[in-house]
């Protein structure tokens, strides 16, 4: 029988080189063997590109569309084909559906006397429109202390966060991860970066510990 699309393709762009489209079929489907997603820039003399989807669960398919750097007016036509049968036709404007790339290289510096310094890298090159628009959320938690989980919003451009070591418990391990969003592009949050683990060995000076002990 003929194939049917149960849930239409929904796409997000990293505003750099990849857009990801996901959809659901009406029944079990071998996405890569049976389906093709064709995409073409509207309004330019341009190539029709073909994306070979992968399975994403029994009835789900996902396709990674390769693109050049995105600009705000870009609009793509999308055609989902099963052989000679056109299953769905739509369009996608990457600038209106942005999910930033996850920040990378999250590093914890504990060699600054009483401060834990977290640094990470902006996932975009300087000439990308998102480069100067990203703000971040840093999640810090402890596997030793399940009750402890904090989100620190970093609303300035510099990809760093300083935390007083004294606000963390001494002698236990913590983990941190970071994600990004771009306010002016009304994006969703990126995926979380891989987490980084560190041991908080900071101890308050004796005088302060003694002071706390007597009060």
């Amino acid at each position: 029988g003929s194939m049917k699309v149960l849930q239409e393709p929904a796409c997000v762009s990293d505003y750099m080189s990849i857009s990801t489209c996901e959809w659901k079929m009406g029944g079990p489907t071998n996405c890569s063997a049976e389906l093709r997603l064709l995409y073409q820039l509207v309004f330019q003399s341009s190539e029709t590109h073909t994306c070979v989807p992968e399975n994403n669960g029994g009835v789900g398919c996902v396709c990674h569309l390769l693109m050049d750097d995105v600009v705000s007016m870009d609009n793509y036509t999308l055609d989902l084909w099963a052989g000679q049968q056109l299953l769905w036709k739509g369009s996608f404007k990457p600038s209106e559906h942005v999910k930033p790339r996850a920040p990378g290289n999250l590093t914890v510096h504990t060699n600054v006397s009483d401060t834990v310094l977290l640094t990470w890298s902006n996932p975009y090159p300087p000439d990308n429109y998102l480069y100067n628009d990203l703000t971040y959320a840093v999640n810090i938690w402890s596997e030793n202390d399940p009750a402890y989980s904090r989100i620190h919003n970093v609303t300035y451009l510099k990809p760093t966060l300083r935390i007083p070591a004294s606000t963390l418990k001494s002698g236990i391990s913590y983990r941190a991860r970071v994600r990004a969003w771009a306010q002016h592009y009304n994006t969703t949050w990126s995926e979380w970066s891989p987490s980084t683990k560190w041991y908080n060995s900071y101890r308050e000076p004796f005088e302060q510990r003694h002071h706390h002990h007597h009060h």
């Epitope: 820039l41 003399s45 050049d68």
Partner: antibody, heavy 118, light 106 residues
Framework: EVTLKESGPVLVKPTETLTLTCTVS????????VHWIRQPPGKALEWLGV???????DYNAAFKSRLTISKDNSKSQVVLTMTNMDPVDTATYYC????????????WGQGTTVTVSS | DIQMTQSPSSLSASVGDRVTITCRAS??????LAWYQQKPGKAPKLLIY???TLAEGVPSRFSGSGSGTDFTLTISSLQPEDFATYYC????????FGQGTKLEIK
């Protein structure tokens, strides 16, 4: 290494048909479009047309009636055919590779100069 | 068809100078603009596309800006190898080029 090289006659008589071949290496014509662009002596560049990886073509409307672009993927060759040549068609003819989803040109041939004269 | 007008048509400058070349489209082309460099007897070389994105291997002294109808190519500090002719190209179908700006040594 990506290279494109144009070949064909250097001299064509008026009303004759020009046939130029662009031989490419370092990439597959099944993955990239190839454009033809020309440049009359001392003048600006002029886009003629393109053949896309899937075999479809787009032409500059000014040349559509007398221009054909075809290709042989297995030979890595793109062929431009332009009929009813005129002295004003004297130019250096370039083939160039299309960059990704944008119709801009990231690799060019060195060009071949064609003179139309009786 | 959309017309591209470059200015100036020629320009004399010295090594180390900051140079700006402009390109104006006859109608809105958004950010669909590329810049090329061409040296005598050679094929053009892609410098910038999407109005501001530097092509692979292009030195950072080159930069592009603008959107809509007005665009600029800037060379922050001219090097001897930068003396050439520069073309803009829009890619709203059909593609057209500007008439070129010849950059010469003063």
């Amino acid at each position: 290494e990506v290279t494109l090289k144009e070949s064909g006659p250097v001299l064509v008589k008026p009303t004759e048909t020009l046939t130029l071949t662009c031989t490419v290496s370092g990439f597959s014509l099944t993955n990239y479009g190839v454009h033809w662009i020309r440049q009359p002596p001392g003048k600006a560049l002029e886009w003629l047309g393109v053949i896309w990886s899937g075999g479809s073509t787009d032409y500059n409307a000014a040349f559509k009636s007398r221009l054909t672009i075809s290709k042989d993927n297995s030979k890595s060759q793109v062929v431009l055919t332009m009929t009813n040549m005129d002295p004003v068609d004297t130019a250096t003819y370039y083939c160039a590779r299309n960059k990704g989803t944008r119709p801009v040109f990231d690799y060019w041939g060195q060009g071949t100069t064609v003179t139309v004269s009786s | 068809d959309i017309q591209m007008t470059q200015s100036p048509s020629s320009l004399s400058a010295s090594v180390g100078d900051r140079v700006t070349i402009t390109c104006r489209a006859s109608e809105n082309i958004y950010s669909y603009l590329a810049w090329y460099q061409q040296k005598p007897g050679k094929a053009p070389k892609l410098l910038i596309y999407n109005a501001k994105t530097l092509a692979e291997g292009v030195p950072s002294r080159f930069s592009g800006s603008g959107s809509g109808t007005d665009f600029t190519l800037t060379i922050s500090s001219l090097q001897p190898e930068d003396f050439a002719t520069y073309y803009c190209q829009h890619y709203v179908s059909p593609l057209t080029f500007g008439q070129g700006t010849k950059l010469e040594i003063k």
